[in-house]
């Protein structure tokens, strides 16, 4: 194996901090898995830098990442998903920094979708439902979900509920009447696989009914 880098490039490179982080997404595109890495310092000069993964692969010893602006990624079926891989930042043949990582411990699920809230007048509650692509997956099937909701006027006052199913009931009496609420959900691996929270789903907005003065009940939306 042979690569090259100008001496000046290497000397400059050694002054930089090449800390990086990565996450994997399993069966993100059919049976294809993905691995995404990025430098923690957004100001690092990435011109001649490449990422390479070696070990715990099928068919090949090492794979080169593809660069897309500031991120580096691989999409392939060829992750063994057993044992640790060595991920290195390289300039030519020289490794600047490496991490040994088990790809099953850095899993970032796909964001939940189709979040919706339905008010049940008779039950005086709100049924929150959402979907996740992970129900159809072979590997990362078991997730913990974090549903977060807030009154729209309360900028940072989120209430969080953790659940393992994709359905949640919010009691009407726990919410303010005649108020606009924002709700969103994210997921994290919860069995065998470890990793990070997914991105948040798109937010859903709903309004609580007003209180009916005679009965003390809220009006439906």
């Amino acid at each position: 194996e042979s690569g090259y880098a100008q001496n000046g490039d290497l000397e400059d490179a050694e002054l930089d901090d090449y800390s990086f982080s990565c996450y994997s997404q399993l069966e993100v595109n059919g049976s294809q898995h993905s691995l995404t890495c990025a430098f923690e310092d957004p100001d690092v000069n990435i011109t001649n830098l490449e990422f390479e993964i070696c070990g715990a692969l099928v068919e090949v010893k090492c794979l080169n990442f593809r660069k897309l602006q500031e991120i580096y990624f691989i999409e392939t079926k060829k992750f063994l998903l057993i044992g640790k891989s060595n991920i290195c930042v390289k300039v030519g043949e020289k490794s600047l920094t490496c991490k040994k990582i088990d790809l099953t411990t850095i899993v970032k699920p796909e964001a939940p979708f189709d979040l919706s809230v339905v008010y049940r007048e008779g039950a005086n509650d709100f049924v929150v439902t959402f979907n996740t692509s992970h129900l159809q997956k072979k590997y990362v099937k078991v997730l913990m979900h974090d549903v977060a909701y807030r009154q729209e006027k309360d900028e940072n006052k989120w209430t969080h509920v953790n659940l393992s199913s994709t359905k949640l009931t919010l009691l009407q009496r726990k919410l303010q009447p005649a108020a606009m609420y924002e709700i969103k959900v994210r997921s994290i691996p919860d069995h065998y696989f470890k990793g990070f929270w997914s991105e948040w789903s798109p937010s859903y907005y709903f309004r609580t009914p007003e209180i009916n003065n005679s009965s003390g009940e809220m009006d439906p939306i």
């Epitope: 194996e1 690569g3 490449e50 068919e59 090949v60 794979l63 080169n64 990442f65």
Partner: antibody
Framework: AVQLVESGGGLVQPGGSLKLSCAVS????????MAWVRQAPKKGLEWVAT????????YYPDSVKGRFTISRDDAKRSLFLQMTSLKSEDTATYYC???????????????WGQGVMVTVSS | DIQMTQSPASLSASLGETVTIECRTS??????LAWYQQKPGKSPQLLVY???SLHIGVPSRFSGSGSGTQYSLKINSLQFEDVASYFC?????????FGSGTKLEIK
């Protein structure tokens, strides 16, 4: 349709130099690793050089390391092989080859050029 | 470096017969193996990759199998157009390496 067309072959004396070119069409060159493979007359195939999709990394067998240099010009849709200090055992048909899979480095080749003959002889 | 041992060097078979070409590697290549067909005066053509995946357009009478260090290419119901040389290639690691080839002829 994908096409790879080699040029630049010919007769050269031992110790001499030659630069082969491969003009590509029908695909985005910058998405692919590219390689040169050679075949001596009536012999088997021998891998000669590979260059990564970014052009930042090159790979050679010991038999040509230090003598051959693979390079690419994606804007001109061309791959090159600069050969120096040529020996009689470098006599072969040289093929430009493209891996089937883009980007990452799965080096099995689904497209080959027609080949160009290099003869090293005094 | 990974060494490739391909056998037999030549093979003569009758039309309609089944033939098998073997390729052995000096270390486990985790299915990083391809097979090529080369007809006289032509460039090689990919037949099989990932040890057992048939390349698009290749007749189904060709099949690849194997794992670890032992791989094979089988041609069922031999046809006249199968007369060619066949090469295995490991792409698990650099340096990439080809087998020495098998020349297939019709009896």
């Amino acid at each position: 349709a994908v096409q790879l067309v080699e040029s630049g072959g010919g007769l050269v004396q031992p110790g001499g130099s030659l630069k082969l070119s491969c003009a590509v069409s029908g695909f985005t060159l910058s998405d692919y690793y590219m390689a040169w493979v050679r075949q001596a007359p009536k012999k088997g195939l021998e891998w000669v050089a590979t260059i990564s999709a970014s052009g930042l990394r090159t790979y050679y067998p010991d038999s040509v390391k230090g003598r051959f240099t693979i390079s690419r010009d994606d804007a001109k849709r061309s791959l090159f092989l600069q050969m120096t200090s040529l020996k009689s055992e470098d006599t072969a048909t040289y093929y430009c080859a493209r891996p089937m899979s883009a980007h990452y480095g799965f080096n099995y080749f689904d497209y080959w050029g027609q080949g160009v003959m290099v003869t090293v002889s005094s | 470096d990974i060494q490739m041992t391909q056998s037999p060097a030549s093979l003569s078979a009758s039309l309609g017969e089944t033939v098998t070409i073997e390729c052995r590697t000096s270390e486990d290549i985790y299915n990083g193996l391809a097979w090529y067909q080369q007809k006289p005066g032509k460039s090689p053509q990919l037949l099989v990759y990932s040890a057992n995946s048939l390349h698009i357009g290749v007749p189904s009478r060709f099949s690849g199998s194997g794992s670890g260090t032992q791989y094979s290419l089988k041609i069922n119901s031999l046809q006249f157009e199968d007369v060619a040389s066949y090469f295995c290639q490991q792409y698990y690691d650099y340096p990439l390496a080809f087998g020495s080839g098998t020349k297939l002829e019709i009896k």
